[in-house]
């Protein structure tokens, strides 16, 4: 089963001190969304027990394997179902905690009920505050049963569930009619998928006989041990205040596990820690009782004393759960409850025994799950024990399961079952991922999904040039870090593969699939310099540059021009895609802007050194366009233009520029300056008779402004061909040739 514990702190005087903590003892638990496993999730489950909305609860992660929920503001926030989800893939497991209000009308005598398929389950709700109304039982939030209030027996309402089946599992509640749901008694019923003492798909396999209140898991036959006990059969007590599958966790606070409820994966459910009982787990066990919820009785013999955390403490000369076994009977010593080996290895397993008469090599044997008996190849005899060593044939997956070491002498016999887990070395399912590349190095993420078993202890990255027959280069890295492959050849393809290992002898897995990673081109090394530039308009700039002369071909694909507008904090980049280019026209720039300009050579995705920067000031943009431009023919060679001044001028106009062009003509237009900016009219002379002309105009302040609308007009008559248009402004009565 997954090593996952949900702890509820039940010191309920102040809901703000209440917290729930989910602790995982799994390797690599909760690291997040990397390849080694999803994070721990801890949340309130409002699907069945809905409580009034309150402020959001606070989730705090403490390291990689612990998450805590706080922020309860009122007692009703606590009532309901909480769940913690941990473990990866097929081992993903949900642990559930059901919290009852201590002030509810009805209280459960026992919250968690774990029963076997076919059993009768009895849920008992104790009357705490009587109401003379019906009691409604619900299952997973839906109506289930009604009891008349007279049906209470000894102040309890009982719900009998005969012949329960796994679908009967869930959250049950008992509520007085017309009482708040928060006043309900909430229960959790867990129905194992098999009858008592059996597990497996067809319930054909026999459970190992879990001790100290451990519950046999109906899927894998493992014992889910109560908090405070460990071992394949939960035969070993942890030190006081410790819990977890290997007793590796410690209860917080000075009073140990007092006031804490422990919830473990199904089919265990929840209980107090070892040595504690009561609805709030604050009462110590009565004399003669021990274990989780104080459910176990010591019944110590031969002078043994009862310890409420571990059970019988035997005097010297005696051992056994009740101190019923004499030390003269042979005894297996210090046998690990669980061993782990890698597939196809040939491990050595040791089994030590003591007794009187003294066990010898032939009196100790090892039995595999399939019934095969192994005899020891050698024995080490010491004054207080004999240790037999067994050489195990090459392991296969079917060797996973319960092995047994047995010692037999004329004084009696003893046996100890232990679990052997045969693990499959991990094999990457995907190729490593390229993160970044340079000309002589590749940065690679070796974290990939894998088949087989974790945890991953080492990652080896094998690489060599593509199509090469040379030996593979190998680099060993930490599982959680990215790898930089260095001293590579530029513009070269490399075949890269990952090999994963798990702890233990023979833990190296097969190599994963290869992937091709190519180093970048060599970096361009030449530094250009700016030859010059000139402004071709308020928003146009022509730039030219040079490169130093070097022997050999030019390493580069083109140039990158960069314009930095410091005022606005904006950068403009212009790509010139020919390495032969030495000039470029930059358009669409912002008039009146001070730019810093540089140029650099690029090759593939790599940039060479930038030229020394130049500073360029573009002239500001001109004024808006003149308004209402109108053309009127005066004769066969004269057309008068009239207009209105532009609006919203940024300064005084220095001149107007008129553009004249023959309509439909192919020739260049002619520009005529009107140097008296106060004018709103001018006469264009020297035009051809009976010819259609196009006119537009713009104003100038520091720079030229926008063009006005274009107007058309034809000259009159059929006169002689003029030499070309000229212009006359109307300034009072004067007529000046401009």
């Amino acid at each position: 089963a997954v090593d996952l514990t949900l702890l509820a702190n039940l010191r309920l005087t102040d809901p703000q001190r209440f917290f729930l903590t989910c602790v995982s003892g799994e390797a690599g638990a909760g690291r997040g969304s990397d390849a080694w496993g999803p994070p721990l999730l801890l949340e309130k489950d409002d699907r069945i027990v809905r409580t009034p909305p309150g402020p959001p609860l606070r989730l705090a992660r403490n390291g990689s394997h612990q998450v805590t929920l706080r922020g309860f503001s009122k007692p009703s926030d606590l009532v309901g179902v909480f769940s913690c989800v941990g473990g990866a893939g097929a081992r993903r497991t949900r642990v559930i905690y059901v919290h009852n209000s201590p002030g509810a009308h009805l209280l459960p005598d026992k919250v968690t009920h774990t029963v076997n398929k076919g059993d009768t389950a009895v849920l008992s709700a104790r009357v705490h505050k009587e109401k003379q109304t019906d009691v409604i039982w619900k299952s997973n939030g839906s109506y289930f049963y009604t009891l008349d209030w007279h049906e209470a027996q000894d102040g309890r309402f009982l719900l009998q569930l005969p012949n329960v089946q796994p679908p009967s599992s869930g959250i049950y509640s008992a509520t007085y009619l017309e009482a708040s749901p928060l006043g309900s008694a909430f229960f959790r019923l867990i129905v194992r998928g098999c009858g008592a003492g059996r597990w497996g798909p067809g319930c054909t396999k026999e459970c190992p006989g879990c001790l100290h209140g451990g519950v046999c898991h109906d899927h894998d036959g493992e014992c889910v041990c109560p908090p405070g006990f460990t071992g394949t059969r939960c035969e070993q007590a942890c030190r006081e205040g410790r819990f977890g599958q290997s007793c590796q966790e410690q209860c917080p606070g000075i009073s140990g596990c007092r006031g804490l409820t422990f919830c473990l994966p199904d089919p265990y459910g929840c209980s107090c820690g070892s040595g504690w009982r009561g609805s709030q787990c604050q009462e110590a066990c009565a004399p003669g009782h021990f274990g989780a919820d104080c459910r176990l009785q010591c019944q110590c013999q031969n002078g043994g004393t009862c310890d409420r955390f571990s059970g019988c403490v035997c005097p010297s000369g005696w051992h056994g759960v009740h101190c019923e076994k004499s030390d003269r009977i042979p005894q297996i010593l210090n046998m690990a409850s669980e061993l782990e080996f890698n597939l196809e290895t040939m491990p050595r397993i040791n089994c030590a025994a003591a007794g009187n008469p003294f066990p010898v090599r032939g009196s100790i044997e090892l039995r595999k799950p399939d019934g095969t008996v192994l005899l020891s190849t050698k024995a080490i005899v010491e004054p207080e024990k004999t240790t037999a060593e067994f050489e195990v044939p090459r392991l296969v997956l079917a060797d996973s399961g319960f092995w047994e070491c047995r010692v037999s002498t004329s004084g009696g016999q003893d046996s100890r079952r232990f679990k052997v887990n045969v693990k499959v070395p991990p094999v990457p399912l995907a190729a490593p991922r390229l993160l970044t590349k340079q000309s002589r190095q590749l940065v690679v993420s070796p974290l990939v999904s894998f088949s087989g078993d974790g945890p991953i202890s080492t990652v080896r990255l094998h690489y060599r040039p593509q199509d090469s027959t040379m030996d593979w280069s190998t680099i060993v890295v930490d599982p959680s870090e990215n790898v930089t492959l260095m001293n590579l050849r530029p513009k070269t393809g490399y075949s890269v593969r990952v090999q994963l290992s798990r702890p233990g002898e023979g833990g190296e897995g097969a190599w994963g699939p290869p992937t091709l990673m190519t180093t970048d081109c060599p970096e361009p090394l030449l530094q250009p310099w700016l030859e010059g530039w000139h402004v071709e308009g308020t928003d146009r700039l022509r730039v030219s540059w040079s490169l130093p002369l070097v022997p050999g071909p030019l390493v580069g694909d083109g140039f990158l021009l960069r314009l930095w507008d410091g005022t606005r904090g904006q950068e403009r980049r212009e790509n010139v895609s020919s390495p032969q280019a030495r000039t470029a026209l930059l358009t669409g720039l912002t008039p009146g802007t001070h730019y810093q300009l540089d140029v650099q050579l690029y090759h593939c995705t790599l940039l060479g050194p930038a030229s020394p920067p130049a500073h360029v000031l573009l002239p500001p943009s001109g004024p808006p366009a003149p308004r209402h431009l109108h053309a009127q023919a005066l004769s066969d060679s004269e057309i008068q233009l009239t207009w209105k001044h532009p609006e919203a001028l940024p300064g005084p106009i220095s001149k107007y520029v008129v553009e004249v062009q023959v309509a439909g003509g192919a020739g260049d237009p002619l520009w005529i300056d009107v140097d008296r900016p106060e004018e709103t009219s001018t006469i264009i002379r020297g035009l051809n008779a009976s010819t259609r002309y196009l006119f537009r105009m713009r104003a100038s302040i520091q720079g030229l402004g926008d063009w006005s609308n274009t107007v058309e007009e034809s000259t009159l008559g059929n006169g002689l061909q003029a030499e070309g248009p000229v212009q006359e402004s109307r300034a009072a009565e004067e007529g000046l040739d401009q």
Epitope: I136, Y143, D148, E178
Partner: antibody, heavy 117, light 110 residues
Amino acid sequence: EVQLLESGGGLVQPGGSLRLSCAASGFTFSRYVMGWVRQAPGKGLEWVSRIYPSGGFTYYADSVKGRFTISRDNSKNTLYLQMNSLRAEDTAVYYCTRIREGYFDYWGQGTLVTVSS
Amino acid sequence: QYELTQPASVSGSPGQSITISCTGTSSDVGGYNYVSWYQQHPGKAPKLTIFDVTKRPSGVSDRFSGSKSDNTASLTISGLQAEDEADYYCGSYTSSGSRVFGTGTKVTVL
């Protein structure tokens, strides 16, 4: 689909007896409170009796107390109403009902009981 | 056996909204959130229309809505339709654990 089917109604003389039955289907009969409601011709609804799932607790309207007995057979999914010492004012359509928290969620089609000489 | 008080009849035109009241005491309507309403067409069995004051069973049109204020519960039928013409009874849980019905209201669609 929940179905309640009453039977056993008919004409009976004052002082006589009659036993109504209600066959239930489409739900787990043994988990529900069941009851009888009657409606005299042209009149409103009147609650008559109810019985809890275990069958051990029964309640009656004052107008029928001591004369009517409600019972159930959970193995047969059947509800009964034994009516003794019938009076003219017991003439009504009798409906079998399933009772949820505070309401009657399913009703049978009814069976007519006529008490007349 | 006491009853809850309802108007004998209520009528309305198609598309209109009508409201039926049901008055009891603090021992029934006012004391519990277990008011229910039943629709009964002539010659048919009653059918649950509203329960727990405001809740609608699946299959009942959302034109039917329930409410409660003090000792009086109300059933509102909006967008009245011809098929809504029927007798309507309110019901309540009582402090004695019993159930009591209203006197009934005949709804006529004009």
